[in-house]
């Protein structure tokens, strides 16, 4: 150990061996549980790269290798053998290795050892005769560990090499620190003037240079905090450490977005055991009090079909907000924690209950001291106006689904929208939400004239009387009579009805659907083939032209090694070539042949296909 | 593992009740140990998304809320309550609901509870006498959804009718897609076949052509998981979704510098909510190569790269042309039976 | 409360065109199409047409196709109905209304058009 | 075009009668059906929509009944005030189309 780990030894901690000896505290690695490859092996490493400094004198090196159904991983801990672990004593505490005894656990292999040199837990010896379970071995697919990455500091060398001696400004050598490691661990540190890190695993930090690292992140989800150590002439996290020569660890925030984020570095030893968040150590930012923080102002629903976000100004600096949402006779509930953003997705909580009445409030915080308050001794905040979704969510644009004709009635179906609201684990559509209480109107006319004529329904389906021989245009409106704001959606995209013409002329338009389906398919897909393309039919070689750009289909279908796409195509060759046989065996003279057409890539190869699918449209 | 869940029950399964009714299998929350933020309420949700069918019809469903110096878990299983679970007898099988019990644990608080009705271990119940500090009680901790279950369970069919289906003129499926959406979010997944997003926030895509899009990164400093929506028509981290049109989110591994980085999509409601790393694609041997590729005649082939789905074009020569109908494409592939890779034949004929 | 105004009565000789105005107050104007109705002296309701003011939509009889033009100005909240080439059988009462999908709620108080030479 | 054919066009009564006036569509309608009171020299008043459903203020005397083309008005118990012009109206297809009226007069 570097000689500065005289980690102050007071009285109460010395402990002494059966020889009056003072004993120090064990070296061991301590990794707590990571995913592990050993399996099948007379002896594994731990890959386990934290050595850590046990607290107590008497604990001891331990290691636990599990195996279930599902996956392998190994601990390794400090322990103090008067106290059982997991349930088990450690009998063997004194030994100097790290030999694996089976124990019994229901559902599961569970093998253990205790051992008390230094570091004895990175190698775990098993008896030979366990080996025998499983004698096709296999590894496994790499876990935590050196193996397989993790935010793992290096081994530690406990050799320090002269390539590894640094001095500091006035020519001492400087040692490597102590710093609390435990990489990223979930933390309930929130709204304190300062936490202590709860991490047990003390790291000699593996170079000289490196200092003490503290990272605090709070989401929607969670709230984690980091500890490492870290070059302070490497960025971090994208940031550079400049707090690395403080002997304190003072958070900063940082911007991330869909987070709060504030990061400290510091060079005393477990310096980023205790992180500071509060205010007047804070030097760097006067202007983060509370007397400069604003109250959000402009609180606005912004909801459609339900999907229900709260908005607000202005856009924070130096501080951050918090979103509360109650019901008025609920509790409230808190939302979007510490956020620079001035919106908060508040659906997941109005879809509990649409009919109920939502209030919600902003809370402005110093961005960096969330527990600073306003005059009144709280957070400054600004409610919301109230919002009942049932009545005033907007209703979203609707889509025409489908319209079919028979003789002189065109049936109009509208799609049922899908929102977020859950009942019985499946999602609601508008009209199982809004029952009779939704209409929708119908807006038709004639392709011909610009005169519409307007229909109503209480279900999704419109029964309208056209006349015979013509094409109608439709658009229809979502509306919700009872209320009186946001009663109408806006109309729907306008879907027209297709004239009919010639026997044939179906079949060309099915290829032209065939062809988008096929567009959409390739579009998911990387295929660069490029392919004979007749970008300028003339019509008396459209035949000629059609048949390479079926030919040419087929490589598509080839490269893609899609069934959805070989399919189409297929389907698509059929249809073509019945109505290209039709017409008779046209012989046509003076056409280019495939292999003399300029070479296109897929896009500029459909759309010509498509153009000259049209002119068969035209002329049938 | 829980049991996949299948619903068709055969008949080794079949238990009969003390009237002699057939005893179906229970339904239960099934996420072993979480790290849980319970504490100090009167009943909380377990904010497991996974609902499991219990192996065996006499299994019940148990519930595990322990609290240490360092953190709180809360687990969630079927047991069979004729065995002892952590060392305890399942007193209260036949309850209803999930009353949680106090266990003595040394160095740790350590509550039980279990129950026999359909997910009953979702919401756990604190005797009152437990929540000293906070009389005032608060419901649970809430998730996404409906009260806090997260995302849907995966057995749940969403029964949606034929009136809801929309068709494009192709007959293909148009309305716009459900998928979990949580952008960027740290992540335990590691080393799994299969992982759930644990991400709690469903949104109905923007557009009818989106898909759900899930991209899992591990760098020497963490984990993430990213749930999105996205067009596959539009690149999505300068890669191509190709397998959007699948039901399921198998992930693909993407060479990206400095971090192990798999994308995938799909397009079925919330598809990217479980996210699959089935083994052929993940690259358990990334030294696999294809040989040199064979000769086409008039052709000629440079190859950028031999490694495992390399795609590669053979070029007529000289005075020669692709004739029509015909690929240059050839693809190195992995022989399932042999491992062994090998390059795909041409269907390409070059002709003057 | 929630009230609809129309203009003053107007007479025209035949030829001539008249403008009809209904201000709307006490509602959310752009939520609620606005519908004219017609009277002739002695006769029944008749239904001219409506207009959206959301999203400037107008849906017309056959019959007045041509004789009426609908149009709102949104910025206040009034609808106007534009009568042209007036012949006597045009003379009439004319009624604006909201109109809440399922009913005409609320009147106006009607407009006396006479047409005479 | 959907027709509405009223009935009867007049009709006598005396206070405290009960008086019932129908409403025939020449084609399906549901129950998108509306009826209106007018006074001489006023604008119509709205008294039932959707076929059964009252508006607001409207006394209770009044009712709506039926759905598809056959709908009819009751009025329980006549009061002196009742006596009027009574229309239907089809709010289901354009050109939403009146009855012709039924006149109620006091006996």
């Known amino acids: 150990i570097p000689p500065h780990v005289q980690k102050s030894v007071n009285n109460d901690m010395i402990v002494t061996d059966n020889n009056g000896a003072v004993k120090f505290p064990q070296l061991c690695k301590f990794c707590d549980v990571r995913f592990s490859t050993c399996d099948n092996q007379k002896s594994c490493m731990s890959n386990c790269s934290i050595t850590s400094i046990c607290e107590k004198p008497q604990e001891v090196c331990v290691a636990v290798w599990r195996k279930n159904d599902e996956n392998i991983t190994l601990e390794t801990v400090c322990h103090d053998p008067k106290l059982p672990y997991h349930d088990f004593i450690l009998e063997d505490a004194a030994s100097p290795k790290c030999i694996m005894k089976e124990k019994k656990k229901p559902g599961e292999t569970f093998f253990m050892c205790s051992c008390s040199s230094d570091e004895c837990n990175d190698n775990i010896i098993f008896s030979e005769e366990y080996n025998t379970s499983n004698p096709d071995g296999g590894g496994g697919s790499g876990g935590g560990g050196s193996g397989g990455g993790g935010s793992i500091p290096p081994h530690v060398q406990k050799s320090v090499n002269n390539d590894m001696i640094v001095t500091d400004n006035n020519g001492a050598v400087k040692f490597p620190q102590l710093c609390k490691f435990c990489d990223v661990r979930f933390s309930t540190c929130d709204n304190q003037k300062s936490c202590m890190s709860n991490c047990s695993i003390t790291s000699i930090c593996e170079k000289p240079q490196e200092v003490c690292v503290a990272v605090w992140r709070k989401n929607d989800e969670n709230i984690t905090l980091e500890t490492v150590c870290h070059d302070p002439k490497l960025p971090y996290h994208d940031f550079i450490l400049e707090d690395a020569a403080s002997p304190k660890c003072i958070m900063k925030e940082k911007k991330k977005p869909g987070e709060t984020f504030f990061m400290c570095s510091c060079s005393s030893d477990e310096c980023n055991d205790n992180i500071i968040f509060s205010e007047e150590y804070n030097t760097s930012n006067p202007d983060s009090g509370t007397t400069n923080t604003v109250a959000a102002y402009n609180l606005t629903w912004k909801s459609t079909n339900f999907k229900t976000i709260l908005e607000w100004e202005p856009k924070p600096v130096n501080q951050v907000y918090t979103v509360q949402i109650s019901t008025k006779s609920g509790d409230w509930k808190s939302k979007c924690f510490y956020t620079t953003d001035t919106e908060c997705d508040l659906t997941d909580e109005i879809v509990k209950d649409v009919k109920q009445t939502y209030l919600a409030r902003v809370f402005s915080y110093p961005a960096g001291n969330v527990e600073s308050t306003g005059s009144a001794g709280e957070p400054l905040y600004e409610n919301s106006p109230e919002f009942t979704p049932y009545l005033e969510t907007n209703l979203g644009q609707p889509t025409i689904q489908s319209f079919e004709q028979v003789g002189t009635k065109v049936n109009v179906t509208v799609e049922d929208e899908r929102t977020l609201v859950r009942r019985n684990n499946t999602f609601l559509s508008l009209r199982d939400v809004f029952g009779k209480d939704l209409i929708y109107t119908l807006y038709y006319w004639k392709s011909s004239s610009s005169g519409k004529k307007t229909a109503k329904t209480n279900t999704n389906e419109f029964l309208i009387d056209v006349d015979k021989g013509e094409n109608y245009c439709f658009s229809v409106q979502a509306v919700i009579p009872s209320r009186t704001v946001n009663r109408k959606s806006t109309d729907s995209p306008v879907e027209c009805m297709g004239q009919e013409k010639g026997e044939f002329r179906e079949n060309w338009v099915n290829v032209i659907s065939d062809l988008k389906k096929i567009e959409d398919l390739i579009q998911s897909m990387h295929i660069d083939a490029t392919l004979y393309t007749e970008s300028d039919v003339h019509p008396s070689c459209k035949v000629t032209a059609m048949k390479c750009f079926l030919l040419e289909l087929q490589v598509i279908s080839l490269e893609s090694g899609d069934a959805s796409i070989h399919d189409t195509v297929e389907n698509l060759i059929i249809l073509a070539n019945n109505s290209l046989s039709s017409n008779g065996n046209v012989t046509e003279s003076g056409c280019k042949e495939c292999e003399e057409l300029e070479e296109k890539n897929i896009k500029e190869f459909l759309q010509s296909f498509v153009h000259i699918v049209q002119m068969f449209i035209n002329t049938s | 593992i829980p049991p996949h869940v299948q619903k068709s029950v055969n008949n080794d399964m079949i238990v009969t009740d003390n009237n002699g009714a057939v005893k179906f299998p229970q339904l239960c929350k099934f996420c072993d140990v979480r790290f849980s933020t319970c504490d100090n309420q009167k009943s909380c949700m377990s904010n497991c998304s996974i609902t499991s069918i219990c192996e065996k019809p006499q299994e019940v469903c148990v519930a595990v809320w322990r609290k240490n110096d360092e953190n709180i878990t809360l687990e969630t299983v079927c047991h069979d309550p004729k065995l002892p679970y952590h060392d305890f007898i399942l007193e209260d099988a036949a309850s209803p609901k999930c009353i949680m019990k106090e266990k003595k644990k040394p160095g740790e608080t350590f509550f039980m509870c279990s129950c026999s009705s359909d997910e009953c271990n979702d919401n756990i119940i604190f005797s009152e006498e437990y929540n000293t500090s906070n009389p005032d009680g608060g419901g649970g901790s809430g998730g996404g959804g409906s009260g806090g279950g997260g995302s849907i369970p995966p057995h749940v069919q969403k029964s949606v009718n034929n009136d809801m289906i929309v068709t494009d003129n192709n007959g293909a499926v148009k309305f716009p897609q459900l998928c979990k959406f949580c952008d960027v979010r740290f992540s335990t997944c590691d080393n799994q076949k299969s992982c759930m997003s644990n991400c709690s926030i469903t949104s109905i895509c923007e557009k009818p052509q989106e898909v759900c899009v899930a991209v899992w990164r591990k760098n020497d400093e963490n984990i993430t998981l990213e749930t999105v929506c996205h067009d596959p028509k539009l690149p999505y981290h300068d890669f191509i979704l190709e397998d959007a049109a699948s039901p399921k989110c198998i992930m693909k591994e993407k060479k990206k510098p400095g971090e192990t980085f798999f994308m995938c999509s799909c397009s079925s409601d919330e598809c990217n909510d479980n996210i699959i790393f089935s083994e052929e694609y993940n690259t358990s041997n990334p030294d696999i190569t294809c040989p040199p590729p064979m000769s086409v005649e008039h052709a000629d082939i440079w190859v950028k790269s031999y490694s495992l789905y390399s795609r590669e074009r053979y070029i007529c020569n000289s005075g020669f042309k692709r004739k029509a109908g015909t690929s240059s494409l050839t693809e190195c592939v992995l022989n399932k039976a042999t491992n062994v890779a090998h390059w795909t034949t041409p269907s390409l004929k070059c002709i003057r | 409360q929630i009230q609809l105004v129309q203009s003053g009565g107007e007479v025209k000789k035949p030829g001539a065109s008249v403008r009809v105005s209904c201000k709307a107050s006490?509602?959310?104007?752009?939520?609620?199409?606005v519908y004219w109705v017609r009277q002739s002296p002695g006769k029944g309701l008749e239904w001219i047409g409506y207009i959206d003011p959301y999203n400037g939509i107008t849906i017309y009889d056959q019959n007045f196709k041509g004789k009426a033009t609908l149009t709102v100005d949104k910025s206040t909240s009034t609808a106007y109905m534009e009568l042209s080439s007036l012949r006597s059988e045009d003379t009439a009462v004319y009624f604006c209304?909201?109109?809440?999908?399922?009913?005409?709620?609320?009147w106006g108080q009607g407009t006396t058009v006479t047409v005479s030479s | 075009d959907i027709q509405m054919t009223q009935s009867p066009a007049s009709l006598s009564a005396s206070v405290g009668d009960r008086v019932t006036i129908t409403c025939l569509a020449s084609q399906t309608i549901d129950t998108w059906l509306a009826w209106y009171l007018q006074k001489p020299g006023k604008s119509p008043q709205l008294l039932i929509y959707a076929a059964t459903n009252l508006a607001d203020g409207v006394p209770s005397r009044f009712s709506g009944s039926g759905s598809g083309t056959d709908f009819s008005f009751t009025i329980s118990s006549l009061q002196p005030e009742d006596f009027a012009t009574y229309y239907c109206q089809q709010v289901y297809s354009s050109p939403f189309t009146f009855g012709q009226g039924t006149k109620l007069e006091i006996k």
């Open positions: 006490g509602y959310s104007f752009t939520d609620y199409n």
């Open positions: 209304a909201r109109d809440v999908t399922t009913a005409l709620d609320f």
